[in-house]
Amino acid sequence: SAHLHPRDSCPLGPGRCCHLETVQATLEDLGWSDWVLSPRQLQLSMCVGECPHLYRSANTHALIKARLHGLQPDRVPAPCCVPSSYTPVVLMHRTDSGVSLQTYDDLVAQGCHCA
Amino acid sequence: SAHLHPRDSCPLGPGRCCHLETVQATLEDLGWSDWVLSPRQLQLSMCVGECPHLYRSANTHALIKARLHGLQPDRVPAPCCVPSSYTPVVLMHRTDSGVSLQTYDDLVAQGCHCA
């Protein structure tokens, strides 16, 4: 709404607020080594960091959630940092007949917001 | 993926895991009393509760986030409880010419999942 203004500058200091971060993970870490063949190591972009009042609010719901959290912190949780979009990834799979390629549209985050 | 099985039973006990909860809020609570006329009190459905491993996972990203949180809890946050869908709400607005109705598609949560 025009009466609620989400903001993009982090009041907590650099790197503290909701942002995208790359985490290295092996197929073993993910428990996928029995059915995914490649890549053996994945660069997984994930959303991490805090969501202070009005920071990168996803929508009207997130804005009012932030406001109500300020009023009733025990009752209403603060918004949290989650993916706003994803980037597709292609994996090589083990199949009965050999190897196949499969795309995942919801595996690696591309952007983050506070919801 | 067929190799990852999100679950719907809460291992923490009744009401502890991610679910929809109704929160009463006045226009004053929301800071909307200067421009919204009605309703004066809103029943806001919000997503609250914890997201233990594999509980109501939103997608593949949430499943691997849960797994990596178990391996690197300081680096990777646990999934958190956010709206999976919304229900539209109509508000009566004050305008320069009088009163108008406006629909908000993203104000009240209808369902929740762990993202």
Epitope: S38, R40, T87, M92, V99, L101, T103, D105, V108 | -
Partner: antibody
């Protein structure tokens, strides 16, 4: 600097065998897939297949399955494309290309190897 | 016959804006990103746009990509003589994996 350097042009007769190469440098060769792309004279690009140089897993386009073999030797950072019995219709420019991080596009290309098959 | 359909040729005068379309289906462009490659005469293809609208470093901002539904397009503004090349779109198809458009020859007039 990322580079893919391909072997030189080849002139062959129908029925002969051939193996062309693509050497990667300037990056971790085993961390990125390598694809092969054909371009027949005056025509467009056709994806032939892909190899993971780390585990040597290969996947072929249905159009090229059984027609060519893709392989790699990670000890010398080189991928290969080979034919056991060439046909005149194999005359084309062949490119190797490195896949981007998530395997959805080709971010670096070799200069191409022209293969001419004629009796 | 390419899975992705491009016009065989487009042309424009220096300084003009041209667009190249790439039409697919719900099994390719409809579900995955589109990438664009430029092939200058006698050279290897070069990545121009990836993931619908991202430019690799070194690609001028005169080049931009977009996607809507099962179609994508490449726009070139401030056309220059050195933009004369073949342009290919590429996506993923559930049946044949990586697919290219048939290519579009861009001619810079004058």
């Amino acid at each position: 600097e990322v580079q893919l350097v391909q072997s030189g042009a080849e002139v062959k007769k129908p029925g002969e065998s051939l193996k062309i190469s693509c050497k990667g440098s300037g990056y971790s060769f085993t961390s990125y897939w390598i694809g092969w792309v054909r371009q027949m004279p005056g025509k467009g690009l056709e994806w032939m297949g892909v190899i993971d140089p780390d585990g040597s897993y290969t996947i072929y386009s249905p159009s090229f399955q059984g027609q060519v073999t893709i392989s790699a030797d990670k000890s010398i950072s080189t991928a290969y494309l080979q034919w056991s019995s060439l046909k005149a219709s194999d005359t084309a420019m062949y490119y190797c290309a490195r896949y981007g991080r998530y395997g959805t596009y080709f971010d670096y290309w070799g200069q191409g190897t022209l293969v001419t098959v004629s009796s | 016959q390419s899975v992705l359909t491009q016009p065989p040729s487009v042309s424009g005068a220096p300084g003009q804006r041209v667009t190249i379309s790439c039409s697919g289906s719900s099994s390719n462009i409809g579900v995955l990103y589109v990438n664009w490659y430029q092939q200058l005469p006698g050279t290897a293809p070069k990545l121009l746009i990836y993931s619908n609208d991202n430019r690799p470093s070194g690609v001028p901002d005169r080049f931009s990509g977009s996607k809507s539904g099962t179609s994508a397009s490449l726009a070139i503004t401030g056309l220059q003589a050195e933009d004369e090349a073949d342009y290919y779109c590429q996506s993923w198809d559930s049946s044949s994996n990586y697919v290219f458009g048939g290519g579009t020859k861009l001619t810079v007039l004058g």
